[in-house]
C-alpha cells in the first residue's frame, strides 16, 4: 500500500495520500463524463467490504479499450496485494448484478470518501 | 432551482428531544448529501453530521450519542433527532448539501436556518 | 481533529481597496478548503471550493489560494455588498471544522 502514487512517484506514497489520489482520479472520471464511460460496459457489482481493492480491480480489469479508467486500473493494483487479471473473481463479487462502469466508479467513489474522512486508510 | 428548508419547534425544554425536518426541491437525495450545521447565537459554525446520498449516516463524534439523521426520499426529506438537550444547544440549525461530485466535502446551498431555543 | 484558525478576527477596508484573510489549519489538508460569506440573519454562502475555485455566481474579485496548512481569501476592490462575517472550511477529515470567522466592514 505505501508504494503507491504512480509511476513518476519519487519514493514511497502514504496510504492516506494515495487514497486521496484515487478518490481524486474517480472524481475526475465523474466530472469529465461526457459520453457513456466505456461505452456503457456493464461490470460485476462488488461488495464494498475488506478486500474491495482487488475486487473492484477484478471487475474493471474485464474492461478493455476503455482509457478514461487506465489510470484507476494502475492505482487500484497498488491497493492489492495479488496479481489480479482478466477473468478472475473473488467471493466479493455479487455475481448476479451487473452494473454500468460509470454507476460502479460512482458507487466505488462514495464508499472511499467515507473512508477517507473517517481515517480508514488500510 | 435548488432549495432546502428547515423546519421544527422554536423552542424545546432542557432534556428534551429536538426533531427538525430538512425539505429540499431541485435535487434528488439519492444524487446527493445533506449535512447539518448549528451555529450557536454570536458564535462560529459546527459542523452535525451528513446523511449520504445512499442513506448512510456519519457524525461529529463530539455529538455522535446523541444524534440520529434520516430521511424520506419519497417526500424529499431528511430528518435531524438530537435527544437530552441543554442550554447550550440553542442554536440556529441549518441543513445544506453538499457539493458530492468533489473529492472535497463543502456546503454549495444552505436552507435558511431555523432559531431552536432551549429554556 | 483538525482545528482551522482564522485571521485576523475582524477588519476593516475602504472602497476599492484590496484585502486577504488567513487561514492555517492545524494538519495538512491539501487543498480541500472552502470559503463562506455570512452577512447578519443570513445563512452561509459558498465563495469558493478546493482552495481557489470560484462558485458559479461569485464576482471574480473574490479568489482563493494556498495549499496544505497555510491559505488565503483575496477580496479586490472592496464594495458594499462584501460586508459580513467570511468562514474557511476544511473538508478533508471528520469532524468538517470550520475557521472562528473574520468580520469584514466598509470603512
Known amino acids: 500500500l505505501t508504494c503507491l502514487g504512480g509511476f513518476a512517484s519519487p519514493g514511497p506514497v502514504p496510504p492516506s495520500t494515495a487514497l486521496r489520489e484515487l478518490i481524486e482520479e474517480l472524481v475526475n472520471i465523474t466530472q469529465n463524463q461526457k459520453a457513456p464511460l466505456c461505452n456503457g460496459s456493464m461490470v460485476w457489482s462488488i461488495n464494498l467490504t475488506a478486500g474491495m481493492y482487488c475486487a473492484a480491480l477484478e471487475s474493471l480489469i474485464n474492461v478493455s479499450g476503455c482509457s478514461a479508467i487506465e489510470k484507476t486500473q494502475r492505482m487500484l493494483s497498488g491497493f492489492c496485494p495479488h496479481k489480479v487479471s482478466a477473468g478472475q473473481f473473488s467471493s466479493l463479487h455479487v455475481r448476479d448484478t451487473k452494473i454500468e462502469v460509470a454507476q460502479f466508479v460512482k458507487d466505488l467513489l462514495l464508499h472511499l470518501k467515507k473512508l477517507f474522512r473517517e481515517g480508514q486508510f488500510n | 432551482q435548488v432549495q432546502l428548508k428547515e423546519s421544527g419547534p422554536g423552542l424545546v425544554q432542557p432534556s428534551q428531544t429536538l426533531s427538525l425536518t430538512c425539505t429540499v426541491s431541485?435535487?434528488?437525495?439519492?444524487?446527493?448529501?445533506v449535512q447539518w450545521v448549528r451555529q450557536p447565537p454570536g458564535k462560529g459554525l459546527e459542523w452535525m453530521g451528513v446523511m449520504w446520498s445512499d442513506g448512510d449516516t456519519s457524525f461529529n463524534s463530539v455529538l455522535k450519542s446523541r444524534l440520529s439523521i434520516s430521511r424520506d426520499t419519497s417526500k424529499s426529506q431528511v430528518f435531524l433527532k438530537m435527544s437530552s438537550l441543554q442550554t447550550e444547544d440553542t442554536a440556529t440549525y441549518y441543513c445544506?448539501?453538499?457539493?458530492?461530485?468533489?473529492?472535497?466535502?463543502?456546503?454549495?446551498?444552505w436552507g435558511q436556518g431555523v432559531m431552536v431555543t432551549v429554556s | 481533529d483538525i482545528q482551522m484558525t482564522q485571521s485576523p478576527h475582524s477588519l476593516s477596508a475602504s472602497l476599492g481597496e484590496t484585502v486577504s484573510i488567513e487561514c492555517l489549519a492545524s494538519?495538512?489538508?491539501?487543498?480541500?478548503l472552502a470559503w463562506y460569506q455570512q452577512k447578519p440573519g443570513k445563512s452561509p454562502q459558498l465563495l469558493i471550493y478546493?482552495?481557489?475555485r470560484l462558485q458559479d455566481g461569485v464576482p471574480s474579485r473574490f479568489s482563493g489560494s494556498g495549499s496544505g496548512t497555510q491559505f488565503s481569501l483575496k477580496i479586490s476592490n472592496m464594495q458594499p455588498e462584501d460586508e459580513g462575517v467570511y468562514y474557511c472550511?476544511?473538508?478533508?477529515?471528520?469532524?468538517?471544522?470550520f475557521g472562528s470567522g473574520t468580520k469584514l466592514e466598509l470603512k
Open positions: 472550511q476544511q473538508g478533508y477529515r471528520f469532524p468538517l471544522t
Open positions: 431541485g435535487f434528488s437525495l439519492t444524487n446527493y448529501h
Open positions: 494538519e495538512d489538508i491539501s487543498n480541500y
Open positions: 445544506a448539501r453538499d457539493g458530492t461530485i468533489a473529492a472535497m466535502d463543502y456546503f454549495d446551498y
Open positions: 478546493h482552495t481557489s
